[in-house]
């Protein structure tokens, strides 16, 4: 039960995280004009990974895409790459994790396969989250560097008579969305990896026998746990010490009331 919950929660958290990474990647407000020196600017600038925008006081917003590829800073290209890799890995991870979910049955998929898929998706989510966090952090570092560089050269002009105020940019909303989303994807991935441990069939040194005393029918179940000898065809991770409380995989057609070991 706890394994199913951990896996399910990991999936949901990762799903929210990846949705956030996609949102952050698409958002225009990666960097916004710093208003410290001009808090009431009539023209507000902000930039994303794909285009830059200008919002005028009338409310009109004009956005222009970065139609060049070679002319863009290498760091921006790197951030784009990290975010896209994060999205792709996350999407694949989601696809894999759907099939790995304990509450979803696909044919006669064994728990060991589900465990492997859960681990794979978990690792994918962790890498996806790290890519997003790295991408956002690289961009943030780039902003900080440019901010202080433009502060040092804030006012230029002939003899100080004419001031050319350089537009300084600070952290935009997308950075915070990206950090949070990356963190959620990472947490979701860790949860999936933890759930994998609970799903994995454990090696035991005894053959488990389960008796179902229900008046008329008695069931002899060899291989309750997959024994070290490989005995028994039932490779499902059965808990035979449940005292009657069955997991979803243990629902049987026997009309028994109690399980005894």
């Amino acid at each position: 039960m706890a394994v199913t919950a951990c896996q399910g929660l990991g999936f949901v958290v990762s799903l929210i995280g990846i949705a956030g990474i996609i949102a952050a990647t698409c958002m225009d407000q990666w960097s916004t004009q710093d208003l410290y020196n001009n808090p009431v600017t009539a023209v507000f600038n902000y930039q994303g990974l794909w285009r830059s925008c200008v919002r005028e006081s009338s409310g009109f917003t004009e956005c222009r895409g970065y139609f060049t590829l070679l002319g863009l800073p290498a760091m921006l290209q790197a951030v784009r790459a990290l975010m896209i890799v994060g999205i792709v890995l996350g999407a694949i991870g989601l696809l894999v994790s759907i099939f790995a979910l304990k509450c979803i049955r696909i044919g006669s998929m064994e728990d060991s396969a589900k465990a492997n898929m859960t681990l794979t998706s978990g690792i994918m989510f962790i890498v996806s989250g790290l890519c997003a966090i790295a991408g956002v952090s690289v961009f943030a570092n780039m902003l900080v560097t440019n901010f202080w560089m433009s502060t040092a050269n804030m006012y230029t002009g002939m003899g100080g008579m004419v001031q050319t105020v350089q537009t300084r940019y600070t952290f935009g909303a997308a950075l915070f969305v990206g950090w949070v989303a990356g963190g959620l994807t990472l947490i979701g991935g860790v949860m999936m990896c933890i759930a994998c441990r609970g799903l994995a069939p454990e090696e035991t040194n005894y053959k488990a026998v389960s008796y179902h005393a229900s008046g008329h029918s008695v069931a002899y179940k060899p291989g309750g746990f997959k024994a070290s000898t490989g005995f028994g065809s039932n490779t499902k991770n059965k808990k035979i010490y449940d005292g009657g409380a069955r997991t979803e995989d243990e629902v049987q057609s026997y009309p028994s009331k109690h399980d005894y070991v």
């Epitope: 009539a42 600038n45 902000y46 830059s52 200008v54 009338s58 009109f60 105020v165």
Partner: antibody, heavy 120, light 113 residues
């Protein structure tokens, strides 16, 4: 066609207040901000502030804060400028203008002006 | 506040002549985000409200005769009237549209000889 109709001339006593109107017609009122300017006789123009009917956002020139108040009556597409504690320095022509939206980012249509004379 | 300085304060020309008036701003009106200059030119005839001639430093407002041309970038701007007509008798103002408070130049009064 776009029109900004301003209220008539005002003769007021020092210390009093005056409220003038600017009625917009011929366009979608909530789309465009309304700007207010002051022009002393034979002098240049001074920006007082603006009001955006879309989100009721109001901005003032620091110089006119406490002196000017902008309000709106959306039902009649009218923006009001109220000037308080009037002195002889407030004697001027006050204009309202529509700020263009989009490519035409400037004050593209102006009212005829409201003349305010402060005299005892 | 951005200070707008216009020169000359007045000039007198004959009809048909070319006129150039200057406007300088204390800060750049060029916005880095869209490489657009936020400067407008207005014409105010006696007893009338100002009329928009040029916005974005060089874009002519619809209905404005093509003899009016705006140019310049950053802090230095120019309004040129290629062939002055009698009806061009007016005061011409430049205006900062980039930062609050919006500020106007002192104006250039154009007189016809």
């Amino acid at each position: 066609q776009v029109q900004l109709q301003q209220s008539g001339a005002e003769l007021v006593k020092p210390g009093a207040s005056v409220k003038m109107s600017c009625k917009a017609s011929g366009y979608t009122f909530t789309t465009y901000p309304i700007e207010w300017m002051k022009q002393n006789h034979g002098k240049s123009l001074e920006w007082i502030g603006n009001f955006h009917p879309y989100n009721d956002d109001t901005k003032y020139n620091e110089k006119f804060k406490g002196k000017a108040t902008l309000t709106v009556e959306k039902s009649s597409s009218t923006v009001y400028l109220e000037l308080s504690r009037l002195t002889s320095d407030d004697s001027a022509v006050y204009y309202c203008a529509r700020r263009g939206y989009g490519s035409s980012y400037a004050m593209d249509y102006w009212g005829q002006g409201t003349s305010v004379t402060v005299s005892s | 506040d951005i200070v707008m300085t216009q020169s000359p304060s007045s000039l007198s020309v004959s009809a048909g002549e070319k006129v150039t008036m200057s406007c300088k701003s204390s800060q750049s009106l060029l916005n880095s985000g869209n490489q657009k200059n936020y400067l407008a030119w207005y014409q105010q005839k006696p007893g009338q409200p100002p009329k928009l001639l040029i916005y974005g430093a060089s874009t002519r407002e619809s209905g404005v005769p093509d003899r009016f041309t705006g140019s310049g970038s950053g802090t230095d701007f120019t309004l040129t009237i290629s062939s002055v007509q009698a009806e061009d008798l007016a005061v011409y103002y430049c205006q900062n549209d980039h930062s609050y408070p919006y500020t106007f130049g002192g104006g250039t009064k154009l007189e016809i000889k």
